[in-house]
């Protein structure tokens, strides 16, 4: 089942899925000046069985030179966007990812793909958190979140991670710092851009990956 919401936002932290469960959708989005072809796939789908999973459908973008615009449509200039984006590079795969049955790897980029990837997760999906550069982790528990089904509704577990500035004084043991929820999200906006760098798979952030920088948006 698709998860209704997105993984929780932790101040000064990013999250990433290391593998995608079957049923995960990745919207076919194109970069500026390009559009999804009319009869092209709407999304890629992680599909398969417990022994082998792969991405079904192919995203295709075509030049939108003959763009159909109206006065009312005002494409947002980059600086107007609510969140900054980075150019997407081919993400590096964690070595152990392929051994996860019923999961897909990060799909390869397609020609003229948008800089943001929009995923729709399914129940059972796990994402991992890491503090952004310039912040360090104070752990109370696992720095991960799982989409779970409870009483017919989906919810994400709360990752036990606080990211504090390098220059900030460390908290004393046992001192509770309130877990701030994201503020100022218009109309219950449930999107989150993720830029990952040196993302660690393990909760303890011990095993590091090669740097991969890309941007993802969830719902």
């Amino acid at each position: 089942e698709l998860c209704d919401d997105d993984p929780p936002e932790i101040p000064h932290a990013t999250f990433k899925a290391m593998a995608y469960k079957e049923g995960t959708m990745l919207n076919c989005e194109c970069k500026r000046g390009f559009r999804r072809i009319k009869s092209g796939s709407l999304y890629m789908l992680c599909t398969g069985n417990s022994s082998h999973s792969s991405w079904d459908n192919q995203c295709q973008c075509t030049s939108s030179a003959t763009r159909n615009t109206t006065k009312q449509v005002t494409p947002q200039p980059e600086e107007q966007k609510e969140r900054k984006t980075t150019e997407m590079q081919s993400p590096m795969q964690p070595v152990d990812q392929a051994s996860l049955p019923g999961h897909c790897r990060e799909p390869p980029p397609w020609e003229n793909e948008a800089t943001e990837r929009i995923y729709h997760f399914v129940v059972g999906q796990m994402v991992y958190y890491q503090c952004v550069q310039g912040y360090r982790a104070l752990h109370r528990g696992p720095a991960e979140s799982v989409c779970k089904m409870t009483h017919g509704k989906t919810r994400w577990t709360q990752p036990q991670l606080i990211c504090t500035g390098e220059m900030e004084t460390s908290q004393f043991p046992g001192e509770e710092k309130p877990q701030a929820s994201p503020e100022g999200r218009p109309e219950s906006e449930t999107s989150c851009l993720v830029t990952t760098t040196d993302f660690q798979i393990q909760t303890e952030m011990a095993a590091t990956m090669e740097t991969s920088i890309f941007t993802t948006e969830y719902q």
Partner: antibody, heavy 114, light 107 residues
Framework: QVQLQQSGAELVRPGTSVKISCKAS????????LGWIKQRPGHGLEWIGD????????NYNEKFKGKATLTADTSSSTAYMQLSSLTSEDSAVYFC???????WGQGTSLTVSS | DIQMTQSQKFMSTSVGDRVSVTCKAS??????VAWYQQKPGQSPKALIY???YRYSGVPDRFTGSGSGTDFTLTISNVQSEDLAEYFC?????????FGGGTKLEIK
């Protein structure tokens, strides 16, 4: 929670035009295709066309070209469908829907009558 | 345009029964098929995407299957609240098209 709130029922004269609105909330309006669907008793559901608000790109079902015009206002996260040269054949319930993952508005009833 | 044919306009079933609604595409649409439930006076609600995957909040008694041209929505252990019309839709080729609908009646 994804929500699509459509404008109220319309009673209009033949030969005129009407503009139906669909206000989106709970997701990034500019990042998703939004479609329009016609439902008439005995005629089932018909896909009119769809629009990508982030770029103003549109697709139309050939059957509705010249009849429907799709637009979007990103500042208010609202999509519009204008229907022109109305006849009794245009009397129907019209739905807006986020294309994928699918989520539909409550529908707008249009009655064309003199 | 691709035609989606739901041959049974009406189906009668009893609470607790298992019922299968079928849909046939006029050409191969892969698994790019969705199923919707529409209750009287309401808008369609998405149940299934990609032929067999359930949307959030959809009870697991609803199961989608099929690929290519033949698709089935199975409702096991039918409940009184399942009284509705069910539509299939293909989104493999533009324009996206719907089946004519199957009305489920509870005996």
């Amino acid at each position: 929670q994804v929500q699509l709130q459509q404008s109220g029922a319309e009673l209009v004269r033949p030969g005129t035009s009407v503009k139906i609105s669909c206000k989106a909330s709970g997701y990034t309006f500019t990042n998703y295709w939004l479609g329009w669907i016609k439902q008439r008793p005995g005629h089932g559901l018909e896909w009119i066309g769809d629009i990508y608000p982030g770029g103003g790109y549109t697709n139309y079902n050939e059957k509705f070209k010249g009849k429907a015009t799709l637009t979007a206002d990103t500042s208010s996260s609202t999509a519009y469908m204008q229907l022109s040269s109305l006849t009794s054949e245009d009397s129907a319930v019209y739905f807006c829907a986020r294309v994928t993952p699918a989520s539909w508005g409550q529908g707008t009833s249009l009655t064309v009558s003199s | 345009d691709i035609q989606m044919t739901q041959s049974q306009k009406f189906m009668s079933t009893s609470v607790g029964d298992r019922v299968s609604v079928t849909c046939k595409a006029s050409q191969n649409v892969g698994t790019n098929v969705a199923w919707y439930q529409q209750k009287p006076g309401q808008s369609p609600k998405a149940l299934i995407y990609s032929a067999s995957y359930r949307y959030s909040g959809v009870p697991d008694r609803f199961t989608g299957s099929g690929s290519g041209t033949d698709f089935t929505l199975t409702i096991s252990n039918v409940q009184s609240e399942d009284l509705a019309e069910y539509f299939c839709q293909q989104y493999n080729s533009y324009p996206y098209t719907f089946g004519g609908g199957t009305k489920l009646e509870i005996k």
